[in-house]
């Protein structure tokens, strides 16, 4: 929800998560705040406290679950409010009716691990974390490696089209650091987006044996 | 502030027809969404209709669906409710709110509205 210099928007990380951020330019910064979410076919209510990120916005985590339970599905509605105190009372200020599977963002993989490394390759694998068992094969990854005396932003993208958790880097330099980074994204939902990029994996390729390019 | 009237109540026979007129004043910039509430006396308040701020979207309890129209008039800050086929269980004080929160939810409450109007009588004979 967007409306002047206000902003309401939130993910489902397609398990037990859904992370909430309100912007709202003015606002005072020591407003207390919070997001309920009301699910529109299940039992359960959560609340989280809204805690500042920055100048004019705050975020929280509505924990759903355990980390690995399946807590909605596709045909979930979640309302979900912003609720501040002003004096006495609670004043809605944002609202959505949030559906999960429409606005997915999964967590970052882990467990990166170099399988194999050359002079001019090296075979990464990784794992998803957290990702709904409904995505089956529909995932699809982007992948970066940092060379020296570059930016990540420099770095050129590697696309995934396919559940593959797993990628062979070719013509790399001998004896030089590297490091990588990957991220994933369902296929499904309308306002869908990339995950964040996992932590970097730094690796070494093996030096150039003597007398050989 | 906002301030919200109402007008257009009245008796009607069962089957009849009313339209009920919302007019706002004050800081109008900051309202969004608008709604009709009914309450009969020994009764919660409980939602009739709502509209967005663009009129959009709209949204109805089931037992007036098909049978009334909320609609809003920017340029004259006023939101109507076009009541058709009245039924004797419609009767009710008929009560005008809006809200400064922005988006959009099916599932508006009481607690969602910020500004309230006084209400006007609706009773539909039989």
């Known amino acids: 929800a967007v409306n002047g210099t206000s902003r309401f928007t939130c993910f489902y990380n397609s398990r037990a998560n859904i992370s909430c951020v309100w912007s709202q330019d003015g606002a005072l910064q020591d407003t207390s705040c919070q997001v309920h979410a009301w699910p529109d076919r299940r039992r359960w209510n959560q609340t989280c406290e809204l805690l500042p990120v920055s100048q004019a916005s705050w975020a929280c985590n509505l924990i759903l679950g355990t980390p690995d339970s399946q807590k909605l599905t596709a045909v979930d509605i979640v309302t979900l409010r912003v609720m501040c105190r002003e004096g006495v009372r609670w004043r809605m200020m944002a609202i959505q009716d949030f559906k999960p599977f429409e606005n997915l963002r999964l967590m970052a993989p882990i467990s990166l691990q170099v399988v194999h490394v050359e002079t001019h390759r090296c075979n990464i694998s990784w794992k998803i974390s957290q990702a709904s068992h409904y995505f089956e094969r529909h995932l699809e990854f982007e992948a970066r490696t940092l060379s020296p005396g570059h930016t990540w932003e420099e770095a050129p993208l590697m696309t995934l089209k396919q559940k593959q958790e797993w990628i062979c880097l070719e013509t790399l330099t001998p004896d030089t650091q590297y490091e990588f980074q990957v991220r994933v994204k369902p296929l499904q939902g309308e306002f869908t987006t990339w995950s964040p990029w996992s932590q970097p994996l730094a690796f070494r390729t093996k030096p150039a044996a003597l007398g050989k390019d | 502030e906002v301030q919200l009237v109402e007008s257009g109540g009245g008796l009607v026979q069962a089957g009849g027809s009313l339209r009920l007129s919302c007019a706002a004043s004050g800081s109008i910039f900051s309202i969004n969404a608008m709604a009709w509430f009914r309450q009969v006396p020994g009764m919660e308040r409980e939602l009739v209709a709502a509209i967005s701020r663009d009129g959009g979207a709209s949204v109805y309890r089931d037992s007036v669906k098909g049978r009334f129209t909320i609609s809003r008039d920017n340029s004259k800050n006023t939101v109507y409710l076009q009541m058709n086929t009245l039924k004797p269980e419609d009767t009710a004080i008929y009560v005008c709110?809006?809200?400064?929160?922005?988006?959009?939810?099916?599932?508006?409450?009481?607690?969602?509205?910020?500004?309230w109007g006084q209400g006007t009588q609706v009773t539909v004979s039989s």
């Open positions: 709110a809006a809200t400064r929160a922005i988006g959009w939810t099916a599932r508006w409450i009481t607690t969602d509205f910020d500004f």
